[in-house]
Interface confidence: low
């Protein structure tokens, strides 16, 4: 059945509406639109003849209508007068007529509303307020919003005058909110600006802060008073009943025991005419002593000594507190507190136990902190390090070696060459060295306080000829597309150039190849199977050169997607089925077969003699590389015909 659907049904002035035609018959001669519920030539809007594709305006055509080939009618720039029924008259090719009627309604766009009020400053628990939404508009719905929420259910809220008036009875301070009204019709909705209701209230009973009532002699007393009130309250202070000042805050510097007593705050609201008071009792105490820390060992030795720190003075019924590095004590089996918490013992001190340490005495009012104490922990020396790290030098250069070992107090250093003492300095300098300066160079570090000493030995070779280098690697079996490998050319030698070759060629240009550490280190990022080549490093200076033995990179890869051969998928009954599976992989993968999902043998070749149609199905080869942890598979369908 031919039907007309209005999209939308409710249209705003100035917008557009589409009269959408459903179930338009086929084989049409043409169609025509009319204003109203019947076909009336005087009210024809537009006609359309399909054969000529000609649209002809009628008496009711306004220039705002567009007829679509599917007979739908679009009316633009809608006016109020467009409201009503529209009839489509369809003439079929056999000249049989069919009609359908649709309708829509036109509504004006609403203006922005505003709120008027009968009382701008109502008093809490006394006054009522009536808000009215302006203007009064025909066919409009009125809504109200409080703080952008719909109206709460309350016996004190009443809507009247077609919801246009909102009355709040017996206002409270909680009614101080943002009020908006909204007007709606089927095509538009407009909200007013906010109106803030200003409810006069209070003062409530004032609160005095801070809440603490105990103070120490010599402190400043700073009391603040606050009472909920609109407009804000005026404040007065009384001490032991005597008026002091008309301020919100009361400040008395450097108080004494004589300042103990009752402190009263009075709050007054000039608009409501109400007064409220609150009293607090302040007690001032005398000053206790400042604590300090004593130690039984001012220079403990690392990993040997224990240290007992004691908080002085000893006061009965007092709580003692400790801090390390401005933090409360960490949980540690090396930290022990005495029963009264006055003594902190550090068992087997380390260099990290230097502190600072603070103790505190807690009384009714506060915590008194001691001055910080720092421990002088004797440690070391650790194993010395000799720099620079070169082991090969050319004749004629200067040899300058430096030694360092972590130690407290700082270590004393001695140098030995081939076991013979040279000098007692941190640095060793020999100018214009020769081959005779080759040997074992020993640095000895000594801590005079702990009596400990440690040594490090370095072999120095002075030679015009460079040694044969070797390649060290950080990963002997890298996995393809996952691992990186760093090759380093040994040894590290002064004034030496490092070179690299791959398969006898100089390094190719590749974003995956990176030289660092003065070309001494070659890094291959994201290795591939093609990187499994012979790598050689070379060193050279102005008088000699040498190359390492080749190192072949063993890249683990695969398994790739396997291939089943032969490729045939159709077999005759009685033939032998001999399938071979192969997958590129390093190391070689493990093979297994499944027929129709059922596991078979763990071999590379699957052999079935004298196959029958029962052997039809899917043959899957699974490959697994235990070294890379990767798996792969392929499925092949086999058809056996009788």
């Amino acid at each position: 059945k031919l039907t007309i659907e209005s999209t939308p049904f409710n249209v705003a002035e100035g917008k557009e509406v589409l009269l959408l035609v459903h179930n338009l018959p086929q084989h049409l001669f043409g169609y025509s639109w009319y204003k109203g519920e019947r076909v009336d030539g005087n009210r024809q809007i537009i006609g359309y003849v399909i054969g000529t594709q000609q649209a002809t305006p009628g008496p009711a055509y306004s220039g705002r209508e567009i007829i679509y080939p599917n007979a739908s009618l679009l009316i633009q720039n809608i006016i109020q007068n467009d409201t009503g029924f529209y009839t489509l008259h369809v003439i079929k090719s056999d000249l049989v007529n069919e009609e359908a009627t649709g309708q829509f309604r036109v509504y004006p766009e609403l203006p922005k509303p505003s709120i008027s009020s009968n009382n701008s400053k109502p008093v809490e628990d006394k006054d009522a307020v009536a808000f009215t939404c302006e203007p009064e508009t025909q066919d409009a719905t009125y809504l109200w919003w409080v703080n952008n929420q719909s109206l709460p259910v309350s016996p004190r809220l009443q809507l009247s005058n077609g919801n246009r008036t909102l009355t709040l009875f017996n206002v409270t301070r909680n009614d101080t909110a943002s009020y908006k009204c909204e007007t709606q019709n089927p095509v538009s909705a407009r909200r007013s600006d906010s109106v803030i209701l200003n409810v006069l209230y209070g003062p409530d009973a004032p609160t005095i802060s801070p809440l603490n009532t105990s103070y120490r002699s010599g402190e400043n007393l700073n009391l603040s008073c606050h009472a909920a009130s609109n407009p804000p309250a005026q404040y007065s202070w009384f001490v032991n009943g005597t008026f002091q000042q008309s301020t919100q805050e009361l400040f008395i510097p450097n108080i004494t025991v004589n300042n103990s007593g009752s402190y009263t705050c009075q709050a007054h609201n000039s608009d409501t005419g109400l007064n409220r008071t609150t009293v607090t009792t302040i007690t001032v105490y005398a000053e206790p002593p400042k604590p300090f820390i004593t130690s039984n060992n001012s220079n403990p030795v690392e990993d040997e000594d224990a240290v007992a720190l004691t908080c002085e003075p000893e006061i009965q019924n007092t709580t003692y507190l400790w801090w390390v590095n401005n933090q409360s004590l960490p949980v540690s089996p090396r930290l022990q507190l005495s029963n009264d918490n006055r003594t902190l013992t550090l068992l087997s001190v380390t260099r990290n136990d230097v502190g600072p340490y603070e103790c505190g005495i807690q009384n009714e009012l506060s915590v008194d902190h001691s001055d910080p104490v720092i421990l002088n922990v004797l440690y070391g020396p650790d194993d010395p390090t000799i720099s620079p790290s070169y082991t090969y030098y050319r004749p004629g250069v200067n040899l300058s070696l430096s030694c360092h070992a972590a130690s407290n107090p700082p270590a004393q250093y001695s140098w030995l060459i081939d076991g013979n003492i040279q000098q007692h300095t941190q640095e060793l300098f020999i100018s214009n060295i020769t081959e005779k300066n080759s040997g074992l160079y020993t640095c000895q570090a000594n801590n005079s306080a702990s009596g400990h000493s440690r040594t490090t030995v370095k072999t120095i070779t002075v030679s015009a000829e460079l040694p044969k280098p070797s390649i060290s690697s950080n990963n002997s079996k890298p996995v393809e597309d996952k691992d990186a490998v760093a090759f380093t050319c040994e040894p590290e030698a002064q004034n030496t150039t490092y070179l690299w070759w791959v398969n006898g060629q100089s390094l190719p240009v590749s974003p995956r190849l990176q030289l660092s550490n003065g070309n001494r280190t070659l890094t291959l990022f994201n290795v591939t199977r093609n990187d499994a080549r012979a790598y050689v490093c070379g060193i050279q200076n102005s008088v000699s050169a040498n190359r390492s033995d080749p190192v072949t990179l063993d890249v683990l890869y695969g398994p790739d997607t396997p291939i089943i051969s032969p490729p045939d998928s159709s077999y005759l009954s009685g033939a032998n089925l001999n399938l071979s599976c192969h997958s590129a992989s390093n190391p070689s993968p493990q093979y297994s077969w499944r027929i129709n999902g059922i596991p078979q043998q763990h071999t590379q070749v699957l052999f079935i003699a004298k196959i029958t149609p029962n052997n039809n199905g899917t043959y899957a080869c699974f490959v697994s590389n235990l070294a890379t942890g990767r798996n792969n598979s392929i499925v092949k369908s086999i058809t056996v015909s009788a």
Epitope: E5, T7, P8, F9, E16, V17, L18, S72, L74
Partner: antibody, heavy 121, light 111 residues
């Protein structure tokens, strides 16, 4: 602002029915059509049908004709889609979406959060 | 019903590249030269999001890098410079006639 809140996930047995709700706010559902679209796991979007809440007229894809019923309650601004004779292939996320000149300019500009219906024995 | 065919099914690109997605209708979806063809973006676990309506109009809040073109039966969605958050599934939909059909979707994935 426009909001569409759908009912929670459902687990149903084959042969039973499910009714999914879609509560609209921020617009008048009478001014739009409410459409229902579903999406099976890992599949594309499939239009099921629509209703004009102003008059209750509904239209369904022939595939669902006889099994699906789309209704609307304008007093609560809620649209419903009921699918009967459920089968395992009806397991999908079902979405509601308004469609019309005022809300979405003849496209589906707003969607519900979706309701997962699982059909399993 | 009008069948919509999207191509490609999957598009692998890198951030910063230009993406071109195609939607072809089995018959014209135009009404007086305006294509009632829309584009949506969908991310896993989320409802579809309207990007382009009626062929070439950007929906509210959609960045300018998204644009639509075409009329009749051939439509294109273009993303001028891909951002990481643009990798998702994209659907076209026609609302020219019932049933309102969707394309099968194009998955835009990171290369």
């Amino acid at each position: 602002q426009v909001q569409l809140v759908q009912s929670g996930a459902e687990v149903k047995k084959p042969g039973s029915s499910v009714k999914v709700s879609c509560k609209a706010s921020g617009f008048n559902i009478k001014d739009t059509y409410m459409h229902w679209v579903r999406q099976a796991p890992g599949q594309g979007l499939e239009w099921m049908g629509r209703i004009d809440p102003a008059n209750g007229n509904s239209k369904y894809v022939p595939k669902f004709q006889g099994r699906v019923t789309i209704t609307a309650d304008t007093s609560t601004s809620t649209a419903y889609m009921e699918l009967s004779s459920l089968r395992s292939e009806d397991t999908a996320v079902y979405y509601c979406a308004p469609f019309g000149y005022y809300v979405s300019d003849y496209a589906m500009a707003y969607w519900g959060q979706g309701t997962l219906v699982t059909v399993s024995s | 019903e009008i069948v919509l065919t999207q191509s490609p099914a999957t598009l692998s690109l890198s951030p910063g590249e230009r993406a071109t997605l195609s939607c072809r209708a089995g018959e014209s979806v135009d009404i007086f030269g305006v294509g009632f063809l829309h584009w949506y973006q969908q991310k896993p676990g989320q409802a579809p999001r309207l990007l382009i309506y009626r062929g070439s109009n950007r929906a509210t809040g959609i960045p300018a890098r998204f644009s639509g073109s075409g009329s009749g039966t051939d439509f294109t969605l273009t993303i001028s410079s891909l951002e990481p958050e643009d990798f998702a599934v994209y659907y076209c939909q026609q609302t020219n006639e019932d049933p309102y059909t969707f394309g099968q979707g194009t998955k835009l994935e990171i290369k």
